[in-house]
């Protein structure tokens, strides 16, 4: 569910939302750390209805959710880390 990507692409998110999405409707969360062409951390959420939204990293609900997911993944498998090439 929780993925961290290191990418040399520019920022992916044009606008961010802080609207709450319950975890039952979330398929995947992608975290893009700041740097490498983008000055801010970005969080991209894939929903179970196939839509995608950028979430404000400061939104309290996403911080709480990521903490829960980190705890869960650390007790099973490590959070996957991927390196992306420029297409």
């Amino acid at each position: 569910v929780l993925e961290v990507y290191y990418t040399s692409l520019r920022c992916r998110c044009v606008q961010e939302s802080s609207v709450f999405i319950p975890r039952r409707f979330i398929d995947r969360i992608q975290i893009l750390p700041r740097g490498n062409g983008c000055p801010r951390k970005e969080i991209i959420v894939w929903k179970k209805n196939k839509s995608i939204v950028c979430v404000d990293p400061q939104a309290e609900w996403i911080q709480r959710m990521m903490e829960v997911l980190r705890k869960r993944s650390s007790s099973t498998l490590p959070v996957p880390v991927f390196k992306r090439k420029i297409p």
């Epitope: 609207v19 709450f20 999405i21 319950p22 975890r23 039952r24 409707f25 929903k47 179970k48 209805n49 839509s51 309290e60 609900w61 709480r64 829960v68 869960r72």
Partner: antibody, heavy 123, light 106 residues
Framework: EVQLVESGGGLVQPGGSLRLSCAAS????????MSWVRQAPGKGLEWVAT????????YYPDNVKGRFTISRDNAKNSLYLQMNSLRAEDTAVYYC????????????????WGQGTLVTVSS | DIQMTQSPSSLSASVGDRVTITCKAS??????IAWYQQKPGKAPKLLIY???TLQPGVPSRFSGSGSGTDFTFTISSLQPEDIATYYC????????FGGGTKLEIK
């Protein structure tokens, strides 16, 4: 007091369509996601659809996806379920239920339910 | 899809008895389980959510416990008005209800 009143149920032939409505009162409708849950005669509960507070997101289980459409009109405090290509196995009491509070971050499930409306699919 | 296996499907108990219903999830659902009571001809009523949080107005004789895949719903002292069918619901990944437990008085 939270009140949810369903309407629009009835007898419909297989392959037919029906539109259910749910009138909400006693809470700020536009702040809550809403869901439909059904119960076949003598059977258990089955989730049918959920729509976000603003109406931009909808979710369905695979068995109704592409046939059912959930929608809402926040100005009228109303929730809808458009059911197309109905099958005998869609026969059930359909309940509307208040779901999570969209303006918060408490991940709570459906808390208030209407009394239901019966949909019978038969030839 | 997550399956919820609820047991028993029916049970008979006496007033004052301690009653326990279990739900087993087919995969880890953290603590995202709720319990509902449904009386004949009525809508379901939420009793407990997030495993053990009692809905306001629900008597303290109702309680819930568990985490991961195994969950328990308990009525500490059965009352005549508790006769109903009880359902668990997982809301970790979409929604899945258990098959229900019909509770009767001996």
């Amino acid at each position: 007091e939270v009140q949810l009143v369903e309407s629009g149920g009835g007898l419909v032939q297989p392959g037919g369509s029906l539109r259910l409505s749910c009138a909400a009162s006693g809470f700020t409708f536009s702040s809550y996601a809403m869901s439909w849950v059904r119960q076949a005669p003598g059977k258990g509960l089955e989730w049918v659809a959920t729509i976000s507070d603003g109406g931009s997101d909808a979710y369905y289980p695979d068995n109704v996806k592409g046939r059912f459409t959930i929608s809402r009109d926040n100005a009228k405090n109303s929730l809808y379920l458009q059911m197309n290509s109905l099958r005998a196995e869609d026969t059930a009491v359909y309940y509307c239920a208040r779901d999570y509070y969209g303006s918060g971050y408490e991940d709570s499930p459906m808390d208030y339910w209407g009394q239901g409306t019966l949909v019978t699919v038969s030839s | 899809d997550i399956q919820m296996t609820q047991s028993p499907s029916s049970l008979s108990a006496s007033v004052g008895d301690r009653v326990t219903i279990t739900c087993k999830a087919s995969q880890d659902i953290n603590k995202y389980i709720a319990w509902y009571q449904q009386k004949p001809g009525k809508a379901p009523k939420l009793l407990i959510y997030y495993t053990s949080t009692l809905q306001p107005g629900v008597p303290s004789r109702f309680s819930g416990s568990g985490s991961g895949t195994d969950f328990t719903f308990t009525i500490s002292s059965l009352q005549p008005e508790d006769i109903a069918t009880y359902y668990c619901l997982q809301y970790d990944n979409l929604y899945t209800f258990g098959g229900g437990t019909k509770l009767e008085i001996k």
